[in-house]
């Protein structure tokens, strides 16, 4: 009765178990009773990343600059090329097949997490006591100016988009206060 299974680094062919080809090599010919599996290294710009019986190696991924892509890690005979995005852009998917511009946080929102090559900007609403008056991919919410520390008073309350406006102390009240 011929075998129905093989060990993990083997494959079943013609009722016998042949050795798989190592990563970085492709299958040229199956083994026989008297000859081992014949494998050949993948060519330039090709790879195979597992023990395999593939007759063709896979082409390395092309990082298309027209799509905002650049090479993060050059491929080898055993690994694919890893693409990432140009500065200011991030991948649209895990496979990083194309890029989009990092989004900016609108006024009233600040940057919670700066974008990376693989993740977009994360914005957060400015809480009470903080503001952002610009659209930015880098700026966090800023704290309102503390008028008191400058020996000034609030003339106009701050919002999530604007800072407080400080003004001089009322001289009369200031005078009465000291007498």
């Amino acid at each position: 009765e011929p075998p129905t299974a093989c060990r993990e680094k083997q494959y079943l062919i013609n009722s016998q178990c042949c050795s798989l080809c190592q990563p970085g090599q492709k299958l040229v010919s199956d083994c026989t009773e008297f000859t081992e599996t014949e494998c050949l290294p993948c060519g330039e710009s090709e790879f195979l990343d597992t023990w395999n019986r593939e007759t063709h190696c896979h082409q390395h991924k092309y990082c298309d600059p027209n799509l905002g892509l650049r090479v993060q890690q050059k491929g080898t005979s055993e690994t694919d090329t890893i693409c990432t995005c140009e500065e200011g852009w991030h991948c649209t998917s895990e496979a990083c097949e194309s890029c989009v511009l990092h989004r900016s946080c609108s006024p009233g929102f600040g940057v919670k997490q700066i974008a990376t090559g693989v993740s977009d900007t994360i914005c957060e609403p400015c809480p009470v006591g903080f503001f952002s008056n610009v659209s930015s991919a880098f700026e966090k919410c800023h704290p309102w100016t503390s008028c008191e520390t400058k020996d000034l008073v609030v003339q106009q309350a701050g919002t999530n988009k604007t800072d407080v406006v400080c003004g001089p102390q009322d001289r009369l009240r200031h005078h009465h206060h000291h007498h």
């Epitope: 075998p3 060990r7 080809c21 190592q22």
Partner: antibody, heavy 127, light 107 residues
């Protein structure tokens, strides 16, 4: 230290059942293929069964097919052999053995061997 | 199933002798053959894998050769600790099979 330790052997009546265990230590058990090999008193070695690292693939000697079941629990580093419908001819020392794939990337196709063996557990089938 | 036949079944030799044990397969198994040494009451110990590669820690007096159907295990100069039973095993396909063993005894 890399070790395999079998347990669960003993005296059992013909037609009875027994479950052998093999506890692995000192290596990443879940990365290795495993085997059971037995040796009847005064006789040679007989391969009994094989299980892949994930437990997905199993194979058996014709003499035990349909009666024995090999399994593994990688979370507990344990290998098992469930033996049913036992016969007198199943009397033997049962060893668990680790399959290893020897490979040198500059070399050819690599080769298998059983590089780590337990001390064995005795199974006696007798009325 | 692939049958392995070892010869001789038993062998008497002296310390310092060169000893050769052969293993013949019923069909071609390329170089998918291993050799083991077993002493009484002990589990087998791997000596050779891939027909000719020496397992780590095994003395260089042990060597293996052959491919296809005919294989040999050679001990170049017998030492007292080499007296044991030797088995060949094919790992080319399932069911994996062992030779019947060769018992090496002291003269």
């Amino acid at each position: 230290e890399v070790q395999l330790l079998e347990s669960g052997g003993g005296l059992v009546r013909p037609g009875g059942s027994l479950r052998l265990s093999c506890a692995a230590s000192g290596f990443t058990f879940g990365s290795y293929e495993m085997n059971w090999v037995r040796q009847a008193p005064g006789k040679g070695l007989e391969w009994v069964s094989y299980i892949s690292s994930s437990g997905e693939t199993t194979d058996y000697a014709d003499s035990v097919k349909g009666r024995f079941t090999v399994s593994r629990d990688n979370s507990k580093n344990l290998l098992y052999l469930q033996m049913n419908s036992l016969r007198a001819e199943d009397t033997a020392v049962y060893y668990c053995a680790r399959d290893v794939f020897f490979f040198d990337s500059s070399g050819d196709n690599g080769a298998y061997g059983m590089d780590v063996w337990g001390q064995g557990t005795m199974v006696t089938v007798s009325s | 199933d692939i049958q392995l036949t070892q010869s001789p079944s038993s062998l008497t030799a002296s310390v310092g002798d060169r000893v050769t044990i052969t293993c013949r397969s019923s069909q071609g198994i390329r170089s998918s053959l291993a050799w083991y040494q077993q002493k009484p009451g002990k589990p087998p110990k791997l000596l050779i894998y891939g027909a000719s590669s020496l397992e780590g820690g095994v003395p260089s007096r042990f060597s293996g050769s052959g491919s296809g159907t005919d294989f040999t295990l050679t001990i170049s100069s017998l030492q007292p600790e080499d007296f044991a039973t030797y088995y060949c095993q094919q790992l080319a396909s399932f069911p994996s099979t062992f030779g019947q063993g060769t018992k090496l005894e002291i003269k």
